[in-house]
C-alpha cells in the first residue's frame, strides 16, 4: 500500500493528516492490482499539490475519486485520460485556482464537486458556470471565484466579456453514397474565444483526411466502405467554455452479399441459418433443387437480428421429412446487384431405406410454400412445384 495510506483490494484511503502524502498514491509492484481499485479517498493531505499526467492512469477501474481538505493546486490535462469508469469526483476544499473542462470532457461523470476552492474569476472557469446552469437545482453547488479585487463572487453572477459557447455548422450534401465513391463534408465554426475545429468520425473504416483553416474545415472520405453505413460523423467546435457539434449520418448503398449460409440445424424448428448484407434492404428468394421455393406457414424466412445493413435469419422448416432433403439456394437482390449461395440439406433418411447406401430416391416439397418479395415478407404465389409425393401433414404442430 502507498506510504501513509491504507488499502483493501478495491479501495485506497489516505486520510490521516500526519505525516501525510506529498504525491498521489501509487501501489507498489506485486501488491494489489491497481485495475481492481474502484475508490480512492484522500483527505487532510496539505502537501498533496499536484496530480500528474501519469499518477492515476494505472487505476483504470476507478469510479470514485475524492480529494478533500487537501492542498491540490494543479491537475494535469491528461490526468484522467485512461479512467473512463470515473463517475464521481470530489475536490472540495482544496487550492484549485483554475480547472479546465478538458480534464473531464471524455468522462461520463455523475458528480463533480468543487466547492471551497479559490477559483480565479476568468474565462477558464466559465464552463463551470455553464455546467451549473444545465444541472437540475438539487445538484447545484455554491461555487465562488475571486475577482480582481480579491472579493468572493458567486459563479452564477460571473460575466466575462468575449467568453461564450462556440457553434458548429455542417454543410453536408445528401449523405447517401454508393460504396466505393467519395464525399466531402464542410464545416464552419464560430465563437469567442475562437474555437478549435475537429472531426469526430468514431470508428470510420473508410479512408478519410481533413483540412482545417481557422474557422473552416473539410473532411474528405474516399473509397467509401459499406461497413460505414449508419455511422455518425460530427464536426465539433470546442473552446474554454464548452463545445458544440453538428452531425450527419452516413448511408452507404451497396449490392447484397450472403456472408453466411450453413447446413440446417435443429432446435424448436429446423433452421437453415444465413447472414445477408446489403443496402437498400435486399429481397430474398429461396430455390429448392433449382426451382422457386414457395413459402408457407410450414417453411418460411425469419429474420431474427437486424444490424444496420446486416440481416441474420433462418429458412425455418416445421418438421421436415426425407422429402425435404436437397439443395437450397438463397438469392439476395437489390438495385445494386445480387448474390446467391447454395447448401445441401439432409433432414432424414427415407423410411425403410438406408440413405447412406441408397441416396437416389425422389424428394418433394410441401405444396403450399410461397415466395417472399422482401425480407420478412411472405406472400402467397401460384407457381407451386408439382409434387410426386405429398408429405403427410396430419401430425403437424399448428
Amino acid at each position: 500500500c502507498p506510504t501513509s495510506c491504507k488499502c483493501s483490494s478495491a479501495r485506497i484511503w489516505c486520510t490521516e493528516p500526519s505525516p501525510g502524502i506529498v504525491a498521489f498514491p501509487r501501489l507498489e509492484p506485486n501488491s494489489v492490482d491497481p485495475e481492481n481499485i474502484t475508490e480512492i479517498l484522500i483527505a487532510n493531505q496539505k502537501r498533496l499539490e499536484i496530480i500528474n499526467e501519469d499518477d492515476v492512469e494505472a487505476y483504470v477501474g476507478l469510479r470514485n475519486l475524492t480529494i478533500v481538505d487537501s492542498g491540490l493546486k494543479f491537475v494535469a490535462y491528461k490526468a484522467f485520460l485512461k479512467n473512463s469508469n470515473l463517475r464521481h469526483i470530489n475536490f472540495t476544499r482544496n487550492k484549485l485556482t483554475s480547472l479546465s473542462r478538458r480534464h473531464f470532457r471524455h468522462l461520463d461523470l455523475s458528480d463533480l464537486i468543487l466547492t471551497g476552492n479559490p477559483f480565479t474569476c476568468s474565462c477558464d472557469i466559465m464552463w463551470l458556470k455553464t455546467l451549473q446552469e444545465t444541472k437540475s437545482s438539487p445538484d447545484t453547488q455554491d461555487l465562488y471565484c475571486l475577482n480582481e479585487s480579491s472579493k468572493n463572487m458567486p459563479l452564477a453572477n460571473l460575466q466575462i466579456p468575449n467568453c461564450g459557447l462556440p457553434s458548429a455548422r455542417l454543410a453536408a450534401p445528401n449523405l447517401t453514397v454508393e460504396e466505393g465513391k467519395s464525399v466531402t463534408l464542410s464545416c464552419s465554426v464560430g465563437g469567442d474565444p475562437l474555437p478549435t475545429l475537429y472531426w469526430d468520425v468514431g470508428n470510420l473504416v473508410s479512408k478519410h483526411m481533413n483540412e482545417t483553416s481557422h474557422t473552416q474545415g473539410s473532411l474528405r472520405i474516399t473509397n467509401i466502405s459499406s461497413d460505414d453505413s449508419g455511422k455518425q460523423i460530427s464536426c465539433v467546435a470546442e473552446n474554454l467554455v464548452g463545445e458544440d457539434q453538428d452531425s450527419v449520418n452516413l448511408t452507404v448503398h451497396f449490392a447484397p452479399t450472403i456472408t453466411f449460409l450453413e447446413s440446417p440445424t435443429s432446435d424448436h424448428h429446423w433452421c437453415i441459418p444465413f447472414t445477408v448484407r446489403g443496402n437498400p434492404k435486399p429481397a430474398l428468394q429461396w430455390f429448392y433443387n433449382g426451382a422457386i421455393l414457395n413459402e408457407s406457414k410450414y417453411i418460411c424466412t425469419k429474420i431474427h437480428v437486424t444490424n444496420h445493413t446486416e440481416y441474420h435469419g433462418c429458412l425455418q422448416l416445421d418438421n421436415p421429412t426425407h422429402m425435404n432433403n436437397g439443395d437450397y439456394t438463397l438469392m439476395a437482390k437489390n438495385e445494386y446487384g445480387k448474390d446467391e449461395r447454395q447448401i445441401s440439406a439432409h433432414f432424414m433418411g427415407r423410411p425403410g431405406v438406408d440413405y447412406e447406401t441408397n441416396p437416389n430416391y425422389p424428394e418433394v416439397l410441401y405444396e403450399d410454400w410461397t415466395t417472399p418479395t422482401d425480407i420478412g415478407d411472405t406472400t402467397n404465389k401460384s407457381n407451386e412445384i408439382p409434387s410426386t409425393d405429398v408429405a403427410d401433414q396430419s401430425n403437424r404442430e399448428h
Partner: antibody
Framework: EVQLVQSGAEVKKPGESLKISCKGS????????IGWVRQMPGKGLEWMGI????????RYSPSFQGQVTISADKSISTAYLQWSSLKASDTAMYYC?????????WGQGTLVTVSS | QSVLTQPPSVSVSPGQTASITCSGN??????VSWYHQRPGQSPVLVIY???KRPSGIPERFSGSNSGNTATLTISGTQAMDEGDYYC?????????FGTGTKVTVL
C-alpha cells in the same frame, strides 16, 4: 534540530481569558500540522485539535469544539491555544506537538492552573 | 468519535516480553501510533503507522494492527521502559488517544 518551545506556566482565575503559545524551529513550520493535547492531573492524554499553519486549516475534537480556539502566526512560526473564559476544570498540562507520522516532536508542556 | 480501550496496567519481568493492546471499532482500517510517557515528562513517539519505528527508538519496540485490535510489543523489556503507554488513531476528522496503560517492570 527540531524544537517546539511552549510559553511558561500560567495561574488564572475562573472567567479570565488566556492564550498560550508554541514556537517551532528547525523545520518548515508551515508544512506540518501542530496538535494540542491536554493532560489533567493524574489522567491520560486528550487530543484537543490541530492546525495547519500553511493555511490555518483547523480541526477540533468534538469535546473541545467551541471551548478553545487554535490559531497560528506563520510569520513567527508560532501556534496558539486560547480560552475566552477559563473554568476550574481547565486546570491541566497542555502540550503542543508536531504531526509527522504520529506526533514526533513535543513541546515541554504549559501548566495552566485555574483557581479562585 | 471512536473510543480506544487499553488495559489499565501490565506487569512484566525484566528481559521478558510485554504486550499492550488497544481496541477500537475497525481499528485495522486506521493507522495507530504509540507513545511512552514517563512521570513528569512529555510523551515520546515509539511507533507510528501501525509498525514503523522513529529513529532513535530501540528495535525491541514493535507494533501490529488488524481487525479491531492494535498491539504494542516490547521484547526484552528494560527498567527504562516503565511508564504510561498510549495508543492514538485518526478517526474521520479528529485524533483520539487510548485510555492508557501503566507498564510496571517487576
Amino acid at each position: 534540530e527540531v524544537q517546539l518551545v511552549q510559553s511558561g506556566a500560567e495561574v488564572k482565575k475562573p472567567g479570565e481569558s488566556l492564550k498560550i503559545s508554541c514556537k517551532g524551529s528547525g523545520y518548515s513550520f508551515t508544512s506540518y500540522w501542530i496538535g494540542w493535547v491536554r493532560q489533567m492531573p493524574g489522567k491520560g492524554l486528550e487530543w484537543m485539535g490541530i492546525i495547519y499553519p500553511g493555511d490555518s486549516d483547523t480541526r477540533y475534537s468534538p469535546s473541545f469544539q467551541g471551548q478553545v480556539t487554535i490559531s497560528a502566526d506563520k510569520s513567527i512560526s508560532t501556534a496558539y491555544l486560547q480560552w475566552s473564559s477559563l473554568k476550574a476544570s481547565d486546570t491541566a498540562m497542555y502540550y503542543c506537538a508536531r504531526g509527522s507520522g504520529g506526533y514526533d516532536y513535543w513541546g515541554q508542556g504549559t501548566l495552566v492552573t485555574v483557581s479562585s | 468519535q471512536s473510543v480506544l480501550t487499553q488495559p489499565p496496567s501490565v506487569s512484566v519481568s525484566p528481559g521478558q516480553t510485554a504486550s499492550i493492546t488497544c481496541s477500537g471499532n475497525k481499528l485495522g482500517d486506521k493507522f495507530v501510533s504509540w507513545y511512552h510517557q514517563r512521570p513528569g515528562q512529555s510523551p515520546v513517539l515509539v511507533i507510528y503507522e501501525d509498525n514503523k519505528r522513529p529513529s532513535g527508538i530501540p528495535e525491541r519496540f514493535s507494533g501490529s494492527n488488524s481487525g479491531n485490535t492494535a498491539t504494542l510489543t516490547i521484547s526484552g523489556t528494560q527498567a527504562m521502559d516503565e511508564g504510561d503507554y498510549y495508543c492514538q488513531t485518526w478517526d474521520v476528522s479528529s485524533y483520539v488517544f487510548g485510555t492508557g496503560t501503566k507498564v510496571t517492570v517487576l
